[in-house]
């Protein structure tokens, strides 16, 4: 009956952690004698290829220095402890402690048997490091040039994390990779870049970090902060201002970051009706007269700059009763 070595094609272990490389000789065959078990690293330099051996009488041996006896152990193999006990070598699973990047590679588990001869199996050990993720908005000011408005950083991952962004804005990402402080790890930084405008301020974008150590991608929301001058519009005019009307109001509606520091109401004609009273963002009209046949201008300032909006007013002689709407205000 043929025997075979059962190993996993690939085993993943966490940097600094402990990993087991399973290795079993199957099936159990009466009279099949396991004379020696060895673990080798075929791709390592010649003086580091022999990793471990288990001799039925002498037990385990670990040639130093890499990985060395401090970091290696056989999980289940047992040596003969006397004339009444046989060695148990069918399970040659090897534990590797304090994983380092240098431990990554191919490992061959080999059983020397009689009478079947030598049989072996190979496992690829991958050393991975779970990255630590963070994302943050960059406070930027309105500009015509593409600017980084958010950063997403995945620190000290192995292999490098994959970063993408979820957003409906018109953006592009710029990625850099640098070596982490832990040997063999990589810190990935992705810059979410766009032409910063008021449209982007307050918008939440999501950084998506994928890594094989995660069960599912990490999703980190980031609310963008763009400082921009006031974007102004005027509301309250309903196309039904008539002479003598007393309940009219214009509102200066503003989107800005930071908050407005001042509102200024004026007219393009230079003449300002005395019955119009500016109260911050509102212009309250006590009584409409012919001077209101003009264009009102609301100018808003903040720390970044100023913005303005105009509203043309047409004063009727009598109310427009057909489809007159609300006056706003």
């Amino acid at each position: 009956q043929d025997v075979r070595v059962q190993v996993l094609p690939e085993v993943r272990g966490q940097l600094g952690g402990t990993v087991e490389l399973p290795c079993h000789l199957l099936p159990p065959v009466p009279g099949l004698y396991i004379s020696l078990v060895t673990w080798q690293r075929p791709d390592a330099p010649a003086n580091h290829q022999n990793v471990a051996a288990f001799h039925p009488k002498m037990g385990p041996s670990f040639p130093s220095p890499k990985p060395g006896s401090e970091r290696l152990s056989f999980v289940s193999a047992k040596q003969s402890t006397g004339q009444d006990t046989e060695a148990e070598l069918q399970d040659a699973t090897l534990a590797l402690h304090g994983l380092t990047v240098e431990d990554e590679g191919n490992y061959t588990c080999e059983f020397a048997t009689f009478p079947k001869g030598s049989v072996r199996g190979m496992t690829w050990l991958r050393v991975i490091a779970k990255p630590k993720n963070q994302a943050e908005a960059q406070k930027v000011t309105f500009s015509q040039d593409p600017t980084t408005v958010a950063l997403c950083i995945s620190k000290e991952g192995r292999p490098p994390a994959r970063i993408s962004w979820l957003s409906s804005l018109d953006w592009e990402a710029k990625e850099t990779q640098v070596s982490g402080t832990l040997a063999g790890t990589v810190t990935v930084t992705s810059r979410f870049t766009l032409v910063p405008s008021g449209r982007a301020d307050g918008v939440t974008v999501t950084c998506k970090v994928e890594h094989e150590s995660f069960e599912e991608p990490a999703l980190i929301p980031v609310t963008l902060s763009v400082r921009y001058p006031p974007e102004v519009s005027i509301s309250g005019y309903d196309d039904n201002w008539y002479l003598g009307r007393t309940d009219a109001t214009l509102s200066c509606d503003v989107r800005s970051n930071p908050e407005p520091t001042g509102y200024d109401w004026s007219t393009t004609s230079g003449t300002f009706p005395t019955s119009a009273v500016a109260q911050g963002s509102q212009l309250v009209i006590h009584a409409v007269d012919s001077l209101f046949n003009t264009t009102f201008v609301c100018t808003v300032t903040n720390a970044v700059g100023m913005g303005r909006a105009e509203q043309v007013i047409f004063v009727r002689e009598t109310p427009n009763t057909a489809g007159a709407g609300a006056t706003g205000g």
Epitope: P30, Y33, S35, L36, A87, E110, P115, G117
Partner: antibody, heavy 116, light 107 residues
Amino acid sequence: QVQLVQSGAEVKKPGSSVKVSCKASGYIFTSYWIHWVRQPPGKGLEWIGAVYPGNSDSNYNQKFQGRVTITADESTSTAYMELSSLRSEDTAVYYCTKLVGTFDYWGQGTTVTVSS
Amino acid sequence: DIQMTQSPSTLSASVGDRVTITCRASQNVGINVVWYQQKPGQPPKTLIYSASYRYSGVPDRFSGSGSGTDFTLTISSLQAEDVAVYYCQQYNTNPFTFGQGTKLEIK
């Protein structure tokens, strides 16, 4: 402790047979293969074959196939190696040895001389 | 069968010398090689197993290396008691086969 004690020296005629015994003690006889290795005078070592006392399974070097029989008697913890159709080149010291990782335990050797 | 070819057949060296014996397999045997020492009138004793692992009780002046087809036994500083015949043996494939031996003498 493990001991393998072999039978005494033999002088045989060409064409005859010889049966060498190896009595084991100090371990579970049925759990380990007993191997036979020979060494002609002034020459190197040559593996002949082995027996597994647990089920009397045997395994031979093709070179000796048909001329050698290796058996084991569980009741006496003794292994036997019988070589037939002897010729002068079979003159050698014959060792029984127990495989524990390597050939770690050996009998004292039995000298077989084939001479007319 | 796998042939194991040892060289040299005879080696004469002085006490304190570094001595190297080589063994070449006719096909790949991995690291499944044992080195034995045999003194006159005695059975062989294991020195090295799995090509490079020193057997218990063996002085650390004995070391082994190699894999695949080429193997080496090194005595770093020859002692008078090391006079013996040295054999390599492969256990990768049935039948087990031995090298023809290297006789080590003191000058």
